[in-house]
């Protein structure tokens, strides 16, 4: 009988896959030491486990548990960064400020940061072709369900104050369909946290608004109120300085509005 | 119906540099990748590299210094070119089809054009 | 990157089932699909199998392809051999750069 296979609207899997993974999570178990009891063939083993012979459009977070089982990690909850839409500055900010944490400074995070993948149903083959789509093919495709379990379990763990990157070069500042508003923001637990403090990005150098006031600000305090948690925002017009100035805090021009 | 043929100089000389054109018809090179195939004489088949249907490009490692892969997709062609060429790079040059799904086989293939570096 | 390697002969007589093995160096043969190419002197090559064993419905059903996980193997089975069988067979695979791999190729010769 011959096969017939899905094209998916998707780039494919990313080259070298499996050697990625497995090179990261060497890397990172090298330079955290709290996680060097980590095996890492093991963790390919259940992250290839997850979705190879699976249908990609029928991936479960239930599929993902032996891999976050694996990859269980204490991070401090009281210094848990989130992003939405502004990846790149967050990770410059948390690998200065180096108590911060990002979803993608844990090990699960690390591992899949920036990849695709996903397997043809009933084939240990990895499919380098194309993977489905979020809003195009299917919603619980491996690399969407992947995001979804870790960010849900990130968001869990976090406590006393939590801070959020938000772009605000961005229409929609807070993005009810980013993973951030569909997942993190309700899995924030109320009674562990405290204060959820969101950060606004300028983008323009000229752009002395404040973004604070944004409808989608607004929408998002509204949200977490609702939840029995505290909203706060600060605008931060000047990405470039705000860095800086976390480098080198006693710089004089640090003390201003940044 | 797909077709697709090689065309280029039949002699080559040393440290030259070798331009191949395959032009294709039957498919539109917007939907498949086109991929170049030598075999020197009397020995095996070497994968040299491919243009994907979106215009991206890889190479075999072991040619990459040496290679670049480009096309024009209003005519249909797709063209190699070799630089610093050796004796050793004597071989049939095949350009082939890669079809638009995850098996990565050739199904259609040029007939070939030989190309002798001069010693 | 793996290797594949095939017999650099095999024979059969007339009417009679041949079977070529290509072995993968590292790594599972199930983890990428294999094909098989037929190649007449001078001629280009024709896909005979791909997907590890399907058949191009041009091709006749005396062509089969099959992995074996035990002998980290891909096989290609021609039953009823024909002279006109007598040809080069090469299998081809990928690596998870989607670099592809030909093996080294198998002269078949009928008797």
């Known amino acids: 009988v011959p096969r017939w296979r899905q094209q998916w609207s998707g780039p494919g899997t990313t080259k070298r896959f499996p050697e990625t993974v497995l090179a990261r999570c060497v890397k990172y178990t090298e330079i955290h030491p709290e996680m060097r009891h980590v095996d890492c063939q093991s963790v390919w083993d259940a992250f290839k486990g997850a979705f190879i012979s699976k249908h990609p459009c029928n991936i479960t977070e239930e599929d993902y548990q032996p891999l976050m089982k694996l990859g269980t990690q204490t991070v401090p909850c009281n210094k848990i960064l989130l992003w939405s839409r502004i990846k790149d500055l967050a990770h410059q900010f948390t690998q200065v400020q180096r108590d911060m944490f990002t979803l993608e400074d844990t090990l699960l995070g690390y591992l899949a940061d920036d990849l695709t993948w996903c397997g043809e149903f009933n084939t240990s083959k990895i499919n380098y072709q194309s993977c489905p789509d979020w809003r195009k093919d299917c919603s619980n495709n491996p690399v969407s369900v992947f995001w979804k379990t870790v960010s849900r379990r990130f968001a869990e763990a976090a406590c006393d104050v939590v801070h959020v990157m938000l772009n605000g070069s961005r229409s929609k500042i807070f993005d009810k369909n980013s993973t951030f508003g569909s997942v993190e923001v309700h899995n924030l637990q109320p009674e562990k946290v405290q204060t959820l403090e969101a950060w606004v990005i300028h983008g323009g150098r000229e752009d002395s608004r404040d973004l604070c006031q944004d409808p989608t600000i607004k929408e998002l305090e509204s949200i977490i109120s609702k939840r029995n948690i505290q909203f706060s925002c600060k605008n931060i017009y000047r990405p470039d300085k705000f860095l800086q100035c976390v480098k080198n805090p006693e710089d004089s021009s640090c003390t201003s509005e940044i | 119906q797909v077709q697709l043929k090689e065309s280029g100089p039949g002699l080559v000389q040393p440290s030259e540099t070798l331009s191949l054109t395959c032009t294709v018809s039957g498919f539109s090179l917007t939907s498949y990748g086109v991929n170049w195939v030598r075999q020197p004489p009397g020995k095996g088949l070497e994968w040299m590299g491919r243009i994907w249907n979106d215009g991206s490009i890889d190479y075999n490692s072991a040619l990459k210094s040496r290679l670049s892969i480009s096309r024009d997709t209003s005519k249909g062609q797709v063209f190699l070119k070799m630089n610093s060429l050796q004796t050793e790079d004597t071989a049939i040059y095949f350009c082939?089809?890669?079809?638009?799904?995850?098996?990565?086989?050739?199904?259609?293939w040029g007939p070939g054009t030989m190309v002798t570096v001069l010693s | 990157q793996f290797t594949l390697t095939q017999p650099k002969s095999v024979s059969g007589s007339l009417r009679s089932t041949i079977t070529i093995p290509c072995e993968r160096s590292s790594g599972d043969i199930g983890d990428n699909y294999v094909s098989w190419y037929q190649q007449h002197l001078g001629r280009p090559p024709i896909n005979v199998i791909y997907?590890?064993?399907?058949?191009p419905s041009e091709v006749s059903d005396r062509f089969s392809g099959s992995i074996d996980s035990s002998s980290n193997s891909a096989s290609l089975t021609i039953t009823n051999l024909q002279m006109d069988d007598e040809a080069d067979y090469f299998c081809q695979s990928y690596d998870s750069n989607i670099d592809i791999i030909f093996g080294g190729g198998t002269k078949l010769t009928v008797l």
């Open positions: 997907a590890d064993d399907q058949r």
């Open positions: 082939a089809r890669g079809p638009y799904n995850n098996y990565w086989y050739f199904d259609f």
